[in-house]
Interface confidence: low
Amino acid sequence: QSPPGKPEIHKCRSPDKETFTCWWNPGSDGGLPTNYSLTYSKEGEKNTYECPDYKTSGPNSCFFSKQYTSIWKIYIITVNATNEMGSSTSDPLYVDVTYIVEPEPPRNLTLEVKQLKDKKTYLWVKWLPPTITDVKTGWFTMEYEIRLKSEEADEWEIHFTGHQTQFKVFDLYPGQKYLVQTRCKPDHGYWSRWGQEKSIEIPNDFTLKD
């Protein structure tokens, strides 16, 4: 039996700059029941506070609801592990909520096969920003990637589209079925997970519609 090992704050992420969650990896428990507490202070403030909500985001986590989330201050966060033999504290993590945003994936992905006048076929991929994202006001500046592959292929082909919410993919093989996904990333934030997969077959004999 021994004091607990040093916990490590794994990451903090916010879906929308309005709330955020931090997760930690416990160290060894020293073979004893061990309690974990997350405490934080804010840049320029002397007070230290305990995690407001240990439940919402699951085990070894702390959820900061709107009431506890500020984008104007840096949070200095630590996790403390305590058992009857002693205690240990994680290295502090400095968090600016603006920089930990991991949004939901883009929505409303649509795929359409189109043809130019020279009979060249292309896939027109369109999508919308995630619901929570207030892109119009500049609160978020979102960048996007799409990835696609034919059903037979092992590797995804990735295209960075910048701020565009549409992309044209040329040089696809007729008769092949293609899978497409999108993801997004705000300024200085993290990529969302890849969104729902959509598929489309490129026709062999595409006839131009008026």
Epitope: E8, I9, K11, K17, I71, W72, I74, D91, L93, Y94, V95, D96, T98, Y99, G138, W139, F140, T141, D187, H188, Y190, W191
Partner: antibody, heavy 118, light 112 residues
């Protein structure tokens, strides 16, 4: 104590490549971005790019795009900066720097002098 | 790219006297989130740069309170209330609101 220890000085021929390493210790490597900044002799500082070691996501200064590649090896807590197609103007001290939390540089390596000369 | 212009280029100061360095950016450094990512670094002779001030006016840990930062938008100032011998070196302002991050040309501070 946070430490960034860089590889030693290099002398390279024009047209070749150089790869500088930056070994981090004293903190959780995946929690903070690593940046690369260079300083030509007697000149100011120039930001080259950054990497998030947790997922190897990178941003580059477009000036170096295509010539610079920044990578990170989580298993050894080491970041790398490779610069290709070297020219004499690339002679500089190259620094790695760790962000305070994201994008200002609280901790710096000791610098690596790269000399490009025929 | 954002151009950061520092003045003066060099400064010779008597110990105990104040010093002031100005930094002007070619565009506003106010991020869409409302924060201003303007920072100050000092590079002492033969050393790597060190962080003094982040986000306009926040002193980094261990930085003496004789250093202060102020400003908004495009105009910023670093003040040293009483210059000491250990303050010699080149001071750089830097912005990280816009990619690529950029630095000013530097201001060399010497002791008279």
């Amino acid at each position: 104590e946070v430490q960034l220890v860089q590889s030693g000085a290099e002398v390279k021929k024009p047209g070749s490549s150089v790869k500088v390493s930056c070994k981090a210790s004293g903190y959780t490597f995946t929690s903070y971005w690593i940046h690369w900044v260079r300083q030509a002799p007697g000149q100011g500082l120039e930001w080259m790019g950054e990497i998030d070691p947790s997922d190897s996501y990178t941003n580059y200064n477009q000036k170096f795009k295509g010539r610079v590649t920044i990578t990170a090896d989580k298993s050894t807590s080491t970041a790398y900066m490779e610069l290709s197609s070297l020219r004499s103007e690339d002679t500089a001290v190259y620094y790695c720097a760790r962000s305070f939390f994201t994008n200002w540089f609280a901790y710096w390596g000791q610098g690596t002098l790269v000399t490009v000369s025929s | 790219d954002i151009v950061m212009t520092q003045t003066p280029l060099s400064l010779s100061v008597t110990p105990g006297q104040p010093a002031s360095i100005s930094c002007r950016s070619s565009q506003s450094l106010v991020h869409s989130n409302g924060n201003t990512y303007l920072h100050w670094y000092l590079q002492k002779p033969g050393q790597s740069p060190q962080l003094l001030i982040y986000k306009v006016s926040n002193r980094f840990s261990g930085v003496p309170d004789r250093f202060s930062g102020s400003g908004s938008g495009t105009d910023f100032t670093l003040k040293i209330s009483r210059v000491e011998a250990e303050d010699v070196g080149v001071y750089y302002c830097s912005q990280s609101t816009h990619v690529p991050f950029t630095f000013g040309g530097g201001t060399k501070v010497e002791i008279k």
